[in-house]
């Protein structure tokens, strides 16, 4: 079939002198290439049979070749054991000896590799990690194994890839293949949807207190998906947190301490592969004043027959901006003294002798007076006058 006709013309003179043109046709066959030359760059694909755990080598040639001792059907060499070399002698009638000796370097079994999602759950909202794992041993030279990933427009030549700084709640597709001596023998694809991201920050509209024991906060929710809110309010070192329904946009805080600065923090969260908290929005207010609590541990002691020393301890709750102690001294229903000090320490002199007095001590915070602490105490008779009279007799 590769032979071709080569026609040559010759001219001779006959005895009569007339020219006779005779044409001779010679069949020639050009020299065939050697099979070694013809199939020098032959490529092979390996197909794996999961049942038999054997490979088939598919020879990438245009014509049906013969394989010497190894039988090959439709250019396929069957029943090849993983990690074993097989020698195939390739010939065809279009080429001459020597045959092409093809060494089939059979790859490891496909099921010995597993494409594993190695993404840490904490980072799964913006990160993908994929890794080929060797889940069984094999005898092939691992140096001859190469890995390739293609994720969108990105190509990696690694056994493991990590993609950070992705978008949350987004599908990404990665195709991967493993090559043995540059022959692909397995591939896998994964579509990974990144996890829900941290919700955004709520936008606080207002945050204020218009009473001594109450406060109010209103807000707009964040744009991204979330499940609920956490509202924390901190006074000094005490912190209380509440879980609030996702549909709320206002919360009334009750049972607050008067004249106290409260720092509020509000964040949305989502429970995904892990709980992700959004950034917290912060605000603060100071509750209004209220009457202070009662002074305590009040004592009235005599310093002389008609002098008293009144002391008390500060109220537990001042509930206002200022600090002032008041003492009212009554005899009967008549107010006889009204004093105000920075400290609860009053020296009351020149009272009537032998008189019952009512001492009322209370705290005033600049806005409100507290409940008075009331004690009754009597002055003594004038001991000096009595003594002088006795001496006179």
């Amino acid at each position: 079939s590769d032979a071709y006709l080569n026609a040559s013309e010759t001219t001779t003179l006959s005895p009569s002198g007339s020219a006779v043109i005779s044409t001779t046709t010679i069949a020639t066959t050009p020299s065939k290439p050697t099979c070694d030359e013809k199939y020098a760059n032959i490529t092979v694909d390996y197909l794996y049979n999961k049942e038999t755990k054997l490979f088939t080598a598919k020879l990438n040639v245009n014509e049906n070749v013969e394989c010497g001792n190894n039988t090959c059907t439709n250019n396929e060499v069957h029943n090849l054991t993983e990690c074993k070399n097989a020698s195939v002698s390739i010939s065809h009638n279009s080429c001459t000896a020597p045959d092409k000796t093809l060494i089939l370097d059979v790859p490891p079994g496909v099921e010995k590799f597993q494409l594993h999602d190695c993404t840490q759950v904490e980072k799964a909202d913006t990160t993908i990690c994929l890794k080929w794992k060797n889940i069984e041993t094999f005898t092939c030279d691992t140096q001859n194994i190469t890995y390739r990933f293609q994720c969108g427009n990105m190509i990696f030549d690694n056994k493991e890839i990590k993609l950070e700084n992705l978008e949350p709640e987004h599908e990404y597709k990665c195709d991967s293949e493993i090559l043995y001596n540059n022959h692909k023998f397995t591939n896998a694809s994964k579509i990974i949807k990144t996890d829900f991201g941290s919700p955004g920050e709520p936008q606080i509209i207002f945050c204020r207190s218009e009473a001594a024991h109450q406060g109010v906060i209103t807000w707009n929710p964040p744009q991204r998906s979330f499940h609920n809110f956490t509202l924390c309010y901190i006074k000094e070192t005490e912190k209380d947190c509440l879980n609030l329904d996702k549909n709320l946009i206002k919360y009334d805080l009750q049972n607050l301490k008067p004249y106290t600065k409260y720092v509020l923090s509000l964040h949305a969260y989502i429970i995904a592969k892990v709980q992700r908290n959004g950034s917290a929005a912060m605000c603060h207010f100071t509750t209004k004043s209220a009457p202070p609590s009662q002074v305590w541990n009040m004592t009235v002691s005599m310093t002389s027959d008609n002098s008293m020393h009144v002391k008390c301890r500060p109220p537990r709750d001042r509930n206002g901006p200022h600090e002032r102690y008041h003492l009212e001294v009554e005899a009967g229903n008549t107010l006889v003294r009204n004093e105000s000090h920075k400290n609860c320490d009053f020296r009351v002199k020149d009272l009537q002798y032998s008189t019952d007095y009512t001492f009322k001590a209370y705290f005033h915070n600049g806005d409100y007076p507290g409940e008075p602490f009331i004690l009754h105490h009597s002055t003594s008779y004038n001991s000096k006058a009595h003594h002088h009279h006795h001496h006179h007799h």
């Epitope: 990160t127 969108g152 427009n153 890839i161 993609l163 950070e164 700084n165 992705l166 990404y172």
Partner: nanobody, 128 residues
Framework: QVQLQESGGGLVRPGGSLRLSCAAS????????MGWFRQAPGKEREFVAA????????YYADSVKGRFTISRDNAKNTAYLQMNSLKPEDTAVYYC?????????????????????WGQGTLVTVSS
């Protein structure tokens, strides 16, 4: 708002090395992927290398694979590009870039114009 300032460019012979630095200020540095792009005279700006916010993931253009290494020091708010075995075709202005979703943009092959924050650039000339 992130500000970026490149340094380390200069003239180098073929086969030589250079290390570019990119200092960042403003924003939380570790939440941004950092990238290097370059623009040769008369050509479009092209991607060179990228590194994720934690430094765990890196990605390179085929033309620089095996020669260039991108790294970052989050404590110093700085990204680096170590360039070895430099070739005349590496001559360009090198730009540092910060983007919170850079690998998303690389996945989709989004044009560099769509990326967020850019430095002013530093010139690298490879010539004998």
């Amino acid at each position: 708002q992130v500000q970026l300032q490149e340094s380390g460019g200069g003239l180098v012979r073929p086969g030589g090395s250079l290390r570019l630095s990119c200092a960042a200020s403003g924003g939380t540095f570790s939440s941004y992927a950092m990238g290097w792009f370059r623009q040769a005279p008369g050509k479009e700006r092209e991607f060179v290398a990228a590194i994720g916010g934690s430094g765990d993931s890196t990605y390179y253009a085929d033309s620089v694979k095996g020669r260039f290494t991108i790294s970052r020091d989050n404590a110093k708010n700085t990204a680096y590009l170590q360039m070895n075995s430099l070739k005349p075709e590496d001559t360009a202005v090198y730009y540092c870039q910060a983007d919170p979703t850079m690998f998303h943009k690389l996945y989709y092959g989004i044009h560099p114009n769509e990326y967020e924050y850019w430095g002013q650039g530093t010139l690298v000339t490879v010539s004998s």
